[in-house]
């Protein structure tokens, strides 16, 4: 389970509010850190182990997911054709 935590908020300027957000995720046994719907998430460790990145549903709703060559990451293709590439080190 993950929750978004607001680390600090700068409201010194009335017309502008700046917030730094981070995810706090507590993974269950058999899960490790991953990405689901473009957000930090706990995912099945076997997905990471086998590098079947698209199985963790990393792209936003409506986007298409494809594995990069050698399973080095994935691409998310928007309906308009724009492609976002994520590589895993």
């Amino acid at each position: 389970t993950c929750e978004i935590v607001t680390l600090d908020r700068d409201s010194s300027q009335p017309r502008r509010t700046i917030a730094r957000q981070t995810a706090r995720c507590a993974c269950r046994k058999g899960q490790i850190a991953g990405t689901t719907r473009a957000r930090p998430a706990c995912v099945d460790a076997r997905i990471i182990k086998t590098k079947q990145w698209c199985d963790m549903l990393p792209c936003l709703e409506g986007e298409g997911c494809d594995l990069l060559i050698n399973r080095s990451g994935w691409t998310c293709t928007q309906p308009g054709g724009r492609i976002k590439t994520t590589t895993v080190s």
Epitope: T22, A23, R24, A26, K29, G30, C42, K49
Partner: antibody
């Protein structure tokens, strides 16, 4: 990666012991940690584990209710407290590391099948 | 409980396979030369090999059974090999009773 256990020795039945594992050579706060023991004539037995950030703990059935595992990420140590000692607690106690490096913002359990490093062990004898 | 054979034997240079089944998540293999002595991980996370372990050691997962293979076994490989994983419910760690490898 180095794991160094201490605190073993001769203990009396009904007493308590505190084992400490000092880690070095890796980012301690990113890894789940384990205590595993080997009792005479037996194989390896899962004793306890703790998540990388210390928020989660789990215990083997033989020590549940008598054991407490804790960690100090600042000092890179993991401790096992075992109360109400019994003769069957006699054995060699090993500290072990789970290989997965949990990223910041995540709390992760280790996995027994992902143990990639062990301490040398510390011997505990429970006898009157 | 995990199931692994109590003993296996082989001549130097032969290939040895030791199986372990009955767990969940990932499997590891741990070598011990004598009771109470140091444990050495030869395989972790199903098929990963620590950098200081010879390439003759390999692991493979098929279903819920993991197989440790030692290709071209050597006299120095004589030891007890324990497998480790999580119990079938995934609530605690569990180890096999150990397989004694004898090199003839």
């Amino acid at each position: 990666v180095t794991l160094d256990e201490s605190g073993g020795g001769l203990q009396t039945p009904g007493g308590a012991l505190s084992l400490v594992c000092k880690a070095s050579g890796f980012t301690f706060s990113s890894h789940g940690m384990f205590w595993v023991r080997q009792t005479p004539g037996k194989g390896l037995e899962y004793v306890a584990e703790i998540t990388n950030d210390g928020s989660g703990t789990n215990y083997g059935s033989a020590v549940k209710g008598r054991a407490t595992i804790s960690r100090d990420n600042g000092q890179s140590t993991v401790r096992l407290q075992l109360n109400n000692l019994r003769a069957e607690d006699t054995g060699t106690y090993f500290c072990a590391r789970s290989t997965y490096e949990c990223p910041g913002g995540f709390s992760c359990w280790g996995d027994t099948g992902q143990i990639d490093a062990w301490g040398h062990g510390t011997e505990v004898i429970v006898s009157s | 409980a995990l199931t692994q054979p109590s003993s296996v034997s082989a001549n130097p240079g032969e290939t040895v396979k030791i199986t372990c089944s009955g767990g969940s998540y990932s499997y590891g293999w741990f070598q011990q030369k004598s009771p109470g002595s140091a444990l050495v991980t030869v395989i972790y996370w199903d098929d990963e090999r620590p950098s200081d372990i010879p390439s003759r050691f390999s692991g493979a997962l098929s279903g819920s059974t993991n197989t440790l293979t030692i290709t071209g076994v050597q006299a120095d490989d004589e030891a007890v090999y324990f497998c480790g994983t999580e119990d079938i419910s995934g609530t605690a760690g569990v180890f096999g009773a150990g397989t004694t490898l004898t090199v003839l």
